[in-house]
């Protein structure tokens, strides 16, 4: 085994009483911002649960991992991390749980090495379409981002703008085609009712897509065909009733895919026959033996893999004269 990195676990804290004196001068190259902990050995700065209202201006140039979680940032303006010289090595930025409700165009500009961004658990009522692309050009410079974590960013109902939340998020993902290199996208727990049909086709490099714990009812208009590199697709805890033939064929055609479908209210009627047949044959669904019917009542908790065609009937539609009120 090799020896530990120098001062491997040493996080130096800046002295709070120095903060006002330092802010009046140009920042020293490797000082630690007030209310933060820094480890040059680990190239890490942690400003966690400090109720910060803005991003510290005096971040050390060596930072590769920046944790700004549990603060009260409210707004990320354009160039929030732009510094001179730039934070050229900042690779992972975690802003989760920092009460952000607005991320403006160009908020992450001038971070040439930023590959992982976590904005989870922020009530993002206003996410600029150009938050990740930085400009409103039809084709922007490629973003270096490969992992974008946007779990639970849906604001409370009363704080939402008068527009589709799904549409706002997707606009930011697609603007300027800047995220063509994105490999991991997490959008769990966002109350999504639908997935705009064009979003996946324009993120061709995706390896991992997490849409769990949303309210997706159908995937009928969603195409997975272009996602030839997709390795995992998380659809647990949604409102899916059935997957139709087109979706089943597309998923089966993805060479490396693993699909997670637990805890959806599957409707086990005649429309489920194709999906049951597919489930019995496919290897792509993880934990497929756990999938159970939610409806109709007589089928509740039946295991999908144990159903046969005789179980999957649709009640005949009665002519109007025979329908009861």
């Amino acid at each position: 085994s090799s020896s530990p990195t120098s001062s491997a676990s040493s996080f130096s804290s800046s002295a709070p009483f120095l903060a006002s004196a330092v802010s009046a001068q140009p920042p020293l190259p490797d000082q630690c911002p007030a209310l933060c902990e820094c480890s040059e050995a680990a190239r890490t700065v942690k400003c966690v649960n400090r109720n910060l209202t803005e991003v510290p201006t005096d971040l050390p140039a060596y930072v590769r991992n920046l944790f700004l979680t549990g603060n009260q940032l409210a707004v990320l303006p354009a160039g929030a991390f732009a510094r001179r010289p730039p934070l050229a090595e900042l690779a992972a930025l975690n802003l989760s749980g920092s009460r952000l409700d607005e991320v403006r165009a160009g908020a992450f500009e001038h971070l040439p090495s930023l590959r992982q961004l976590d904005l989870s658990h922020n009530p993002l009522a206003d996410l600029s379409p150009f938050a990740f692309s930085g400009s409103n050009a039809s084709v922007s410079a490629p973003s270096p981002l490969v992992e974008l974590i946007l779990n639970h960013i849906v604001p409370p109902e009363d704080e939402r703008q008068n527009r589709s939340f799904e549409g706002m998020v997707v606009a930011a993902l697609l603007a300027g085609r800047a995220l063509q290199g994105l490999r991991r996208l997490e959008l769990a727990s966002n109350h999504f009712l639908y997935l705009p049909r064009d979003v996946l086709a324009q993120l061709p490099s995706l390896r991992h897509l997490d849409l769990s714990n949303n309210s997706l009812v159908s995937l009928t208009y969603v195409s997975f065909r272009n996602l030839t590199h997709l390795e995992s697709l998380h659809l647990e805890d949604n409102a899916l009733k059935v997957l139709h033939n087109g979706t089943l064929a597309e998923l089966q055609g993805l060479p490396h895919i693993r699909v997670f479908l637990d805890n959806n209210p599957w409707v086990c009627d005649c429309h489920m026959a194709d999906m049951v047949t597919w489930l019995k044959e496919t290897e792509v669904v993880q934990g497929k033996d756990r999938l159970t019917c939610a409806y109709p009542e007589k089928m509740r908790n039946r295991v999908l893999l144990e159903l046969n065609s005789a179980d999957l009937d649709c009640d005949p539609i009665l002519p109007p004269s025979l329908q009861t009120s």
Partner: antibody
Framework: EVQLLESGGGLVQPGGSLRLSCAAS????????MSWVRQAPGKCLEWVSA????????YYADSVKGRFTISRDNSKNTLYLQMNSLRAEDTAVYYC??????????????WGQGTLVTVSS | DIQMTQSPSSLSASVGDRVTITCRAS??????LNWYQQKPGKAPKLLIY???SLQSGVPSRFSGSGSGTDFTLTISSLQPEDSATYYC?????????FGCGTKLEIK
């Protein structure tokens, strides 16, 4: 003192399966991304797979994607590599290594001694 | 994925010599490059991280430089115990990759 100890290697037939383990001690295991790296006899080092500290993110070399699965049990301080559909070209010494820093900013500062996997009929 | 090319693949030098090994990335990787030393039958050992930072406990005769696509590992005064294979590794990409090594022998 940080220690990584691999086990589970051995002789397996083509198409067979094997599960490697790496027992970690001397550090807070869940705080570190971990990786498997292999080296075929007389050949270069090949990065195989990695996993984040929480286990929520996994990464695979194209050569093993769909056949190998990396996982970890943070309660047992153990890293795993499940290897299925093994091929002759998977024959190698498999090293477990610790990433220092996050996956996207890291270097491997500690390595185990390796365990030999031989795939042959 | 990012390819790493090392040169030379092998070299022979005398004790006291200054030795330089180069590593080239197929695209810019900023300074996300590490160097490892491996001796026969042993696990690799970290020498240099972040292109130029010396790992604790590694002799100061080892140094690293470079940024972007071209990187160099230098041994300022070769010692007998430096006989080994040296590997570069990039951690900029979504998948991390090693160069194929430079085998250094002592004359």
């Amino acid at each position: 003192e940080v220690q990584l100890l691999e086990s589970g290697g051995g002789l397996v037939q083509p198409g067979g399966s094997l599960r490697l383990s790496c027992a970690a001690s001397g550090f807070t295991f869940s705080s570190y991304a971990m990786s498997w790296v292999r080296q075929a006899p007389g050949k270069c080092l090949e990065w195989v797979s990695a996993i984040s500290g929480s286990g929520g993110s996994t990464y695979y070399a194209d050569s093993v994607k769909g056949r190998f699965t990396i996982s970890r049990d943070n309660s047992k301080n153990t890293l795993y590599l499940q290897m299925n559909s093994l091929r002759a070209e998977d024959t190698a010494v498999y090293y477990c290594a610790r990433y220092y820093g996050g996956y996207y900013s890291a270097w491997m500062d500690y390595w185990g001694q390796g365990t030999l996997v031989t795939v042959s009929s | 994925d990012i390819q790493m090319t090392q040169s030379p693949s092998s070299l022979s030098a005398s004790v006291g010599d200054r030795v330089t090994i180069t590593c080239r990335a197929s695209q810019s990787i900023s300074s996300f490059l590490n160097w490892y030393q491996q001796k026969p039958g042993k696990a690799p050992k970290l020498l240099i991280y972040a292109a130029s930072s010396l790992q604790s406990g590694v002799p100061s005769r080892f140094s690293g430089s470079g940024s972007g696509t071209d990187f160099t590992l230098t041994i300022s005064s070769l010692q007998p115990e430096d006989s080994a294979t040296y590997y570069c590794q990039q951690t900029y990409g979504y998948l991390h990759t090693f160069g194929c090594g430079t085998k250094l022998e002592i004359k």
